[in-house]
Interface confidence: low
């Protein structure tokens, strides 16, 4: 969490941002809140990006003002216009690109004063893993597949019964480049699995951590999936 205060003495307002991550090709949110004003027409929101000449987005007098918007963000940004009045200046970014990563500034002007806060935005790819039992092998194996990751993640297997065990010798992980030549499909196979045990396939890079759990008994499968974005710090 980053909390920024106004620049000009007593006419300062609190602006809060949260560091976040964007999934390439999907929509992302750059989070920013501020002390609300009672009049929408008195609120100006400017989003800037370090190293980019034009504005990322500008909202003033109750509507978008995009004449100074940088080309790289053309047609890809929007604020939640109906929530500005309650102090939400978050920016929706469509079709996140790798190049969208960087330091952003949320700059706010209201009748109470000015304020700004920086936000670190990471971009990459992350997806939920799917864990299946593979009966095609000579011994029972588990196959963990996740369609989109970037940068290349690490894959670690764990087991509820053999806690702390190292499965690197009995697993094999491969990375296959997807058609857009950036993200990769992750496939990891775990051999010699035992029945009535819960196994976890954990995929992690510096942006996200995803876990797929599977428990196989004689009569059924139970699964659980979890995806967590890393480094979501507020400022």
């Amino acid at each position: 969490l980053i909390i920024g205060f106004g620049i000009s003495g007593r006419h300062s307002i609190t602006v809060t941002t949260v560091a976040s991550a964007g999934n390439i090709g999907e929509d992302g949110i750059l989070s920013c809140t501020f002390e609300p004003d009672i009049k929408l027409s008195d609120i100006v929101i400017q989003w800037l990006k370090e190293g980019v000449l034009g504005l990322v987005h500008e909202f003033k007098e109750g509507k978008d003002e995009l004449s100074e918007q940088d080309e790289m963000f053309r047609g890809r940004t929007a604020v939640f216009a109906d929530q500005v009045i309650v102090g939400n200046a978050s920016l929706r970014l469509k079709n996140v690109q790798l190049t969208d990563a960087g330091t952003y500034k949320c700059y706010i002007i209201t009748s109470k004063g000015k304020g700004n806060a920086n936000l670190e935005y990471k971009t990459g790819a992350f997806s939920m893993p799917e864990v299946n039992v593979d009966y095609n092998a000579s011994s029972e194996t588990l196959r963990c597949e996740a369609p989109r990751w970037f940068p290349q993640p690490t894959v670690v297997w764990a087991s509820q019964v053999d806690q702390g065990a190292n499965f690197s010798e009995v697993s094999n992980t491969s990375f296959e480049l997807n058609s857009e030549n950036v993200t990769m499909k992750v496939v990891s196979v775990l051999y010699n699995v035992t029945i009535n045990n819960t196994y976890s396939c954990m995929i992690e890079n510096d942006i996200a951590k995803a876990t797929g759990d599977i428990k196989v008994t004689e009569s059924e499968i139970k699964r659980r999936s979890h995806l967590q974005l890393l480094n979501s710090k507020a400022s």
Partner: antibody, heavy 118, light 107 residues
Framework: EVQLQQSGPELVKPGASVKISCKAS????????MNWMKQSHGKSLEWIGD????????SYNQKFKGKATLTVDKSSSTAYMELRSLTSEDSAVYYC????????????WGQGTTLTVS | DIQMTQSPASLSASVGETVTITCRAS??????LAWYQQKQGKSPQLLVY???LLADGVPSRFSGSGSGTQFSLKINSLQSEDVARYYC?????????FGAGTKLELK
């Protein structure tokens, strides 16, 4: 080429039983579970159960326990589903389907067997 | 049981249009979701598995997205041969369930 060839349409009387077959070819029969689905006319699909061709182990949807019995004949690479105590509610198209992996999506389906109870 | 709610129940579109079908799971199913196409009088065919992965031989105009409880199937540049009923299916647990289906017709 993977194929699942099901037996032909059946017209049976209420209270009777019927046994539908699904002959697998183009892959090693014992390498994949076989699943069975029901599709009533104009309706969606329901999972009936699955069978492990290696040991005959089965799992059933609670709704079909006592109604359906799944078996296999490894020597002929054929899976069977017997439906008993038939009523008009059992009139439907029945499919066998092979999953991508156990407990996965179904990448191969039989052509379906139409059962009419009348 | 996990309930799968599909919408719309039916839709009509013209050749070349983009259509989107949505599917909602009654609980979090991660990416354990598949989409099937079923043409009149035929058996279902797998289009998408793991929510986003295209099955072998499926044209690239089909795409799947979503995870957790909200999923969608998108068909870009609709072709006449896409007229069919579409079903979503979860396989998060042993008892798999299907959506009620979406009937896609040509205008």
């Amino acid at each position: 080429e993977v194929q699942l060839q099901q037996s032909g349409p059946e017209l049976v009387k209420p209270g009777a039983s019927v046994k539908i077959s699904c002959k697998a070819s183009g892959y090693t029969f014992t390498d994949y579970y076989m699943n069975w689905m029901k599709q009533s006319h104009g309706k969606s699909l329901e999972w009936i159960g699955d069978i492990n061709p290696n040991n005959g182990g089965t799992s059933y949807n609670q709704k079909f326990k006592g109604k359906a019995t799944l078996t296999v004949d490894k020597s002929s690479s054929t899976a069977y589903m017997e439906l008993r105590s038939l009523t008009s509610e059992d009139s439907a198209v029945y499919y066998c389907a092979r999953p991508y992996y156990y407990g996965s999506s179904y990448d191969y389906w039989g052509q379906g067997t139409t059962l009419t109870v009348s | 049981d996990i309930q799968m709610t599909q919408s719309p129940a039916s839709l009509s579109a013209s050749v070349g249009e983009t259509v989107t079908i949505t599917c909602r799971a009654s609980e979090n199913i991660g990416s354990y979701l598949a989409w099937y196409q079923q043409k009149q009088g035929k058996s279902p065919q797998l289009l998408v598995y793991a929510a986003t992965l295209l099955a072998d031989g499926v044209p690239s105009r089909f795409s799947g997205s979503g995870s957790g409880t909200q999923f969608s199937l998108k068909i870009n540049s609709l072709q006449s041969e896409d007229v069919a009923r579409y079903y979503c299916q979860h396989y998060y647990s042993t008892l798999v369930t299907f959506g009620a289906g979406t009937k896609l017709e040509l205008k």
